[in-house]
Amino acid sequence: ANSLLEETKQGNLERECIEELCNKEEAREVFENDPETDYFYPKYLVCLRSFQTGLFTAARQSTNAYPDLRSCVNAIPDQCSPLPCNEDGYMSCKDGKASFTCTCKPGWQGEKCEFDINECKDPSNINGGCSQICDNTPGSYHCSCKNGFVMLSNKKDCKDVDECSLKPSICGTAVCKNIPGDFECECPEGYRYNLKSKSCEDIDECSENMCAQLCVNYPGGYTCYCDGKKGFKLAQDQKSCEVVSVCLPLNLDTKYELLYLAEQFAGVVLYLKFRLPEISRFSAEFDFRTYDSEGVILYAESIDHSAWLLIALRGGKIEVQLKNEHTSKITTGGDVINNGLWNMVSVEELEHSISIKIAKEAVMDINKPGPLFKPENGLLETKVYFAGFPRKVESELIKPINPRLDGCIRSWNLMKQGASGIKEIIQEKQNKHCLVTVEKGSYYPGSGIAQFHIDYNNVSSAEGWHVNVTLNIRPSTGTGVMLALVSGNNTVPFAVSLVDSTSEKSQDILLSVENTVIYRIQALSLCSDQQSHLEFRVNRNNLELSTPLKIETISHEDLQRQLAVLDKAMKAKVATYLGGLPDVPFSATPVNAFYNGCMEVNINGVQLDLDEAISKHNDIRAHSCPSVWKKTKNS
């Protein structure tokens, strides 16, 4: 019906306005409404002006899109000609009464379909339904994926590309780890991935100055070390070094009036020469204090070495050996005086005897046929040696003695000459001063070691060798090597060390084979004024341990392998060190600091006497230990 109406209108328009000329009223009759008429008539007049006879010119024709009046007029009512819609965005154009309707393709909007719809911003379909990237395009959109992702067949979802599965050799010898959108070539800790060689290469952490003092790099890691011998230990961060701190302060007060007899491990502490009138006789008076049971207090001889007198201690008692042209004698007597108390000792040459008194009470009287030392040229010349004797004397002694004596003397009076001159010499030399108070035991000051040669082989036992150690310790610092067995090749097949525990104010005891800790006894309160008792037994098959808290046989997967390392070393030759380590590499043991404190050691049933050591640092006190420092009210 609608198209029929359109055809009628078209016929009327032909008849009224093209074949004839029409005015506006006649045009109103054709369209039967004002809007269309008002739209049509001005345009009709333009057509007339263009094509009416006599008005036509070539120039005008060239500006007109229509070849004749009919075409020009017929086109006026069609709102869709020329096309008002956006050609890209429209689907169809519908002519209306002086208007048009553009129907848009999907993805376009607007009266003329001139505006692209941004599907990516559609709130009802977030991101256009794309899982990653939404790309808006004129009239449409498409989804895309980020690098390392691939589009699924629905063209919306992006899936991670598993590069590790896609190219199994992508990381070479490293481990490939897939991560969203990418992959990583992973190396074990301490290794770095090399893109060129597609392999994991060891990081030389030492070249990156990771450690404060010494650094040892190894495949996959590194270890920092601190110079324990200079009093440093590794801090908790395992990189920096900190001073090994005192956990039990000791009373290290000394007095120059007290002469320390064990200043030298080997050698005389003091040498005096007397030139007195010939009527003089030998005499020595002094107060003496020691816990040592054997050693030389003083040795006196004539200027020509023909006569000598030795005042010593053996089994804790005074011993006198003498030799001159008339006689050769040895006498031991009196009470035991190695009790740590001050004992007044006097040795006096009388006309026919030598009198030895302790606390002014005679304990020995040694007969002598003549003067001890023969005067020459009207003078009695005598040499006196404290805490030792010249080396050649050793072979002349009536009974051999270990000369080393850890003790002190005070208030001495030699040859009735008082102490004048001697005190001045001692005053200047700090290491000749004796501690004011001492206790029984051996003291390791944290600056040196003692070496012993001990044969651990036990022929009667099936194990072949065994190490049974008892330690009585009272440490002063919480870190240090107490005992170490050292091989000829500078390795440490066994060590017992102390380290400050991670828990405050306590210590751990480490048992180590070479640089591996085979057992750690944790959190013991060892820094106290009470001694702690530790025992351990080790042979090629077992390791047993006894501490104040428990007794146990240690066994773990790695222990047998470590004991095999120890076994191999024990079959060769090992040296035993107390109080620290000799010059071995820092990396040879987990701890390398010297032990500081008191310690008594018994190995395989024998109490070790530091006076019997092959070598001993001078500062180690074999038979005396400083008392614990007591805080006084005004200090």
Partner: antibody, heavy 119, light 106 residues
Amino acid sequence: EVKLEESGGGLVQPGGSMKLSCAASGFTFSDAWMDWVRQSPEKGLEWVAEIRSKANNHATYYAESVKGRFTISRDDSKSGVYLQMNSLRPEDTGIYYCTLTTAFLFDYWGQGTTLTVSS
Amino acid sequence: QIALTQSPAIMSASPGEKVTMTCSVSSSVSYMHWYQQKPGSSPRLWIYDTSNLVSGVPGRFSGSGSGTSYSLTLSSMEAEDAATYYCQQYSGYLYTFGGGTKLEIK
């Protein structure tokens, strides 16, 4: 729109042979990895074979149970993937699906074709 | 070969009920994919890379897990969710599927 259409299924005797075809459309076939997955009530879903794209040298992979008996092939010019099955066994019975595989998952599945191996 | 074990094999749930099904792996894998299959139809990719829902999959579905344990969870069961769900992984040039969990509506 992605379309996968399997054909070639049917009844075959044990020891016999059969060739399955899969016609693909709606995606760039030459870039795609194509797989065959089968389903049976006894074994459930079971991956059979995979053929990768030209970029991956048309590499082929097979399930242990079909190795040496089945051959997967493709014709990129025809957008087709094929499964030649020899020495068939009763346990090969099931619905065979052709799949478009994207990054190690079965992104799109055809409707399937049924293979029955029975005497 | 890595084996996938789905549990339970069959389960039923009332509308609105929360549902969880699991997929245990014999050795650790990086990703798990899930498929939905309704009777008479081909399986459809449902969840990929452990937790990503395929476009058009209702938000009441979710996936999670890592290493050797993965799960698919449905926060509120609806009738249209009744189907069999399969888990799948790829490792060492082999694809493996779980035995499936059949989810029925009560």
